[in-house]
């Protein structure tokens, strides 16, 4: 999977929707220059490809939605990497340009003769990609050509700015909301001193910026803030972990506004350095309840509290997906590669046979084994439906009383489609209302997850709360079996009576040493001792001064 030859999944139709999914992991640091992608992904890749193909089948067989119009698609692999996604987006654009030139009769062969060649249909809109950084790059290109983009998991706050990203919309909320949710969790458990880590790139950077701003307003201190690339090498992760340990035992909580693979890198480093149980990770929705993040490193992840976008499993997707087999699934060009990777065997005799596996896949293999649906499946499907409803509303207004594509709709005008999409309002796959605000954002509801040891060597994510519209609800008993088990993450303990906080130069406001006031001083505020005026003395609680009662000495009084 390198830059020379990219695989594409096609489904024919009257209108073609583009999609960018991370079918493969991003290139490792040493392979970035050749844009050589990593291993195939199931949840973020294959499942999303299949969701697109099957959702379009459902839309096309729904007589009430886009009657007499067939939706098709062109699915490309973003590899969760900007350079790859841009390269793929250029292919989408190229299709559009060739098609529009053809409409104007501009297609000419090299020798100057006219061409009877029918090019591919233009892409009217794009679903995805998943990553915010990648989505920004793709949007910068797509908006030049008025191609609307609907994201299913790009949550960066920057994308709300319509002056910069006019053709961008999303069926997920902005990260400002989950940053607030994370701060609310930190506040709830009185963690006033935490370390912070974020993934290099827009998602992590803007999310962590919001977390830090909100934390400061709430009196929460950040011991230190670190950033790291998701595809950083072992050494980089080890170095980061060593830095985090330098803030122990005070900053035990690590707030991680991270992509899932960054969290995995941290867990792996914890294993290498023997640091399991030293930290409590508070993770953003990049981690959520993903098993591909914790697999093999459950001990290191135990106790982790994560934010997950609320999205129930989609039953009809599983009914379709779990029946798929490599010998019959020919429309997904990555499926055979995935099957071999998933079951660690080779599809002997097939063109995509992977000889790195010795064992031949047998016919009893099934996707039902250890199946986990992509946690963002509902959003992926809602994004596809949004595009369909937007096109449907556009058809209704441009082609009244006409079933199918009328001339007024040909070729599809991206500006009009965007207008129509922004007004879209329908019931989503989980029964929730899908609509877009003036920034193209959707409202947000989160679930709070806790990664726990459920039994001997059995670990799982448990729903321990929710955050909805600014209100945090947590089942504290589920997270902490006893109050005394609540982890402490504070820099300094409160000062005793008659002591003030002395903050050393260059230290954050949550770290202090407690110093007692002098004998004649009282605690004026938490940082200042003040001497009592002549004739007065500190009160017993040392919070003020009382006048010293005047005592007159008489002859005969004993010496004091």
């Amino acid at each position: 999977q390198s830059s020379e030859r990219r695989v594409v999944a096609h489904m024919p139709g009257d209108i073609i929707i583009g999609a960018l999914f991370s079918v493969h992991h991003q290139p490792t640091v040493d392979k970035v220059h050749e844009r050589k992608c990593g291993a195939v992904r199931e949840q973020y890749g294959i499942q999303r490809v299949e969701a697109m193909l099957h959702t379009l089948e459902r839309i096309n067989s729904d007589p009430t939605l886009l009657p007499n119009i067939t939706l098709g698609c062109e699915i490309r692999d973003s590899c969760w990497h900007s350079a790859v996604a841009l390269e793929q987006s250029i292919e989408f654009i190229r299709d559009s340009l060739i098609s529009s030139e053809e409409e104007e009769g501009l297609v000419r062969c090299v020798d100057g003769s006219s061409s009877s060649f029918r090019s591919k249909k233009p892409i009217v809109g794009v679903i995805g990609p998943g990553s915010s950084s990648v989505a920004i790059q793709v949007q910068n290109l797509l908006q030049l050509f008025n191609i609307p983009q609907i994201a299913y998991s790009a949550t960066s706050m920057d994308l709300s700015d319509k002056t910069l990203f006019k053709y961008f919309m999303r069926v997920v909320p902005s990260d400002a909301q989950q940053a607030r949710a994370m701060v609310d969790i930190v506040k709830r458990y009185n963690w006033t001193y935490v370390s912070a880590v974020h993934t290099e790139g827009n998602y992590g950077e803007s999310g962590m910026e919001a977390f830090k701003d909100m934390s400061a307003k709430e009196g929460i201190c950040i011991a230190h803030s670190y950033k790291i690339y998701s595809n950083a090498g072992e050494q980089s992760f080890d170095k980061l972990l060593k830095k985090l340990t330098s803030h122990l035992p005070k900053a035990r909580v690590v707030a991680c506004f991270c992509e899932g693979m960054t969290v995995r890198g941290l867990l792996m480093a914890m294993r290498r350095l023997g640091l399991a149980g030293e930290f409590l990770l508070l993770g953003s929705d990049g981690w959520a309840d993903r098993y591909d993040v914790t697999d093999g490193y459950q001990r290191e992840a135990v106790g982790g509290i994560t934010i997950k976008l609320q999205s129930p499993d989609v039953k009809w997707f599983d009914d379709y997906y779990l029946k798929l087999r490599p010998e019959t699934n020919h429309r997904n060009p990555w499926f055979q590669e995935f099957w071999q990777h998933r079951f660690q065997c080779r599809l002997e005799g097939f063109p995509q046979e992977n000889s790195k596996y010795n064992k031949t896949c047998n016919s009893s293999l099934t996707l039902k084994t250890h199946h986990v649906q992509d946690s963002k499946m509902g959003f992926v499907i809602n994004a596809i439906y949004s595009m369909a409803y937007g096109l449907h509303n556009m058809q209704m207004s441009l082609c009244p009383g006409y079933a199918g594509l009328c001339d007024a709709m040909k070729p599809i005008d991206g500006r009009k489609l965007l207008e129509s999409l922004m007004k879209t309002n329908f019931t989503g796959v989980s029964g929730d209302t899908i609509l877009f605000d003036e920034n193209g954002d959707s409202p947000g509801r989160y679930e709070i997850m806790n990664f726990k040891e459920m039994g001997k060597d059995y670990f799982d994510y448990i729903n321990v709360g929710s955050w909805d519209n600014g209100e945090l609800k947590m089942d504290d008993d589920e997270v902490w079996s006893k109050k005394s088990n609540i982890i402490r993450s504070v820099c300094s303990e409160p000062c005793e009576k008659g002591q003030i906080k002395v903050i050393r130069k260059g230290e954050v406001s949550c770290c202090w040493t407690c110093t007692p006031c002098k004998e004649n001083e009282y605690v004026f505020d938490e940082y200042t001792c003040k001497a009592c005026q002549l004739g007065s003395w500190p009160t017993d609680d040392l919070t003020g001064c009382d006048l010293i009662p005047v005592q007159y000495l008489r002859w005969g009084d004993p010496e004091p």
Partner: antibody
Framework: QRQLEESGGGLVKPGGALTLTCKAS?????????ICWVRQAPGKGLEWIAC???????TYYATWAEGRFTSSKTSSTTVTLQMTSLTAADTATYFC?????????????WGQGTLVTVSS | DIVMTQTPASVEAAVGGTVTIKCQAS??????LAWYQQKPGQPPKLLIY???TLESGVPSRFKGSGSGTEFTLTISDLECADAATYYC???????????FGGGTEVVVK
């Protein structure tokens, strides 16, 4: 000298059972090899029965052989084929052969075969 | 049902001549075809696998071609030692099974 040798053939009554053994010498059935069973009725052509992956003992059978024939790896140099409910149609020379897959690479090492006769 | 149809059943050619044997798969099998030579009282010997790859030690006079459902084995510069029965073996990846052709007897005059 790398070779495979089959044993266990002989005369068996209809409805009876028999276990054939394939023993390797000069090689062991290391994890990337497949040991397959092929039979040939007297004067007739070849017929594929089954394969076993030496790595973990996963088996692959011809549809007609499923249930009646069972292949297992009993050591690093031996594989067996258990045959039950035998009929006259099962009379044949049984070969074991080694390949790099169930079939797409062919079988590059064969035993001399062992004759099984099913008769009352 | 999966079947490998091999033709002809028997062919006769002179020393130095050329023989062509055809094999047809009942289903698309990509390049999953092997050719064997078997002499009386001996086990089969692998000549070609993956439709056209010559097994080591096999003379280049043996040539395999074809893909999908139609395959051919060509033996040129026939020698007396080439007199034998030749079998094709098709591997059907979609059902993970094998089938052999009925065999072709080559007689060298």
């Amino acid at each position: 000298q790398r070779q495979l040798e089959e044993s266990g053939g002989g005369l068996v009554k209809p409805g009876g059972a028999l276990t054939l053994t394939c023993k390797a010498s000069g090689i062991d059935f290391s994890s990337y090899y497949y040991i397959c069973w092929v039979r040939q009725a007297p004067g007739k052509g070849l017929e594929w029965i089954a394969c076993i992956y030496a790595g973990d003992g996963t088996t692959y059978y011809a549809t007609w052989a499923e249930g009646r024939f069972t292949s297992s790896k009993t050591s690093s140099t031996t594989v067996t084929l258990q045959m039950t409910s035998l009929t006259a149609a099962d009379t044949a020379t049984y070969f074991c052969a080694r390949g790099s897959g169930v079939g797409s690479y062919g079988y590059n090492l064969w035993g001399q075969g062992t004759l099984v006769t099913v008769s009352s | 049902d999966i079947v490998m149809t091999q033709t002809p059943a028997s062919v006769e050619a002179a020393v130095g001549g050329t023989v062509t044997i055809k094999c047809q798969a009942s289903e698309y099998i990509y390049s999953n075809l092997a050719w064997y030579q078997q002499k009386p009282g001996q086990p089969p010997k692998l000549l070609i696998y993956r439709a056209s790859t010559l097994e080591s030690g096999v003379p280049s006079r043996f040539k395999g071609s074809g893909s999908g459902t139609e395959f051919t084995l060509t033996i040129s510069d026939l020698e007396c030692a080439d007199a034998a029965t030749y079998y094709c073996q098709g591997y059907f990846p979609s059902i993970i099974t094998n089938a052999f052709g009925g065999g072709t007897e080559v007689v060298v005059k």
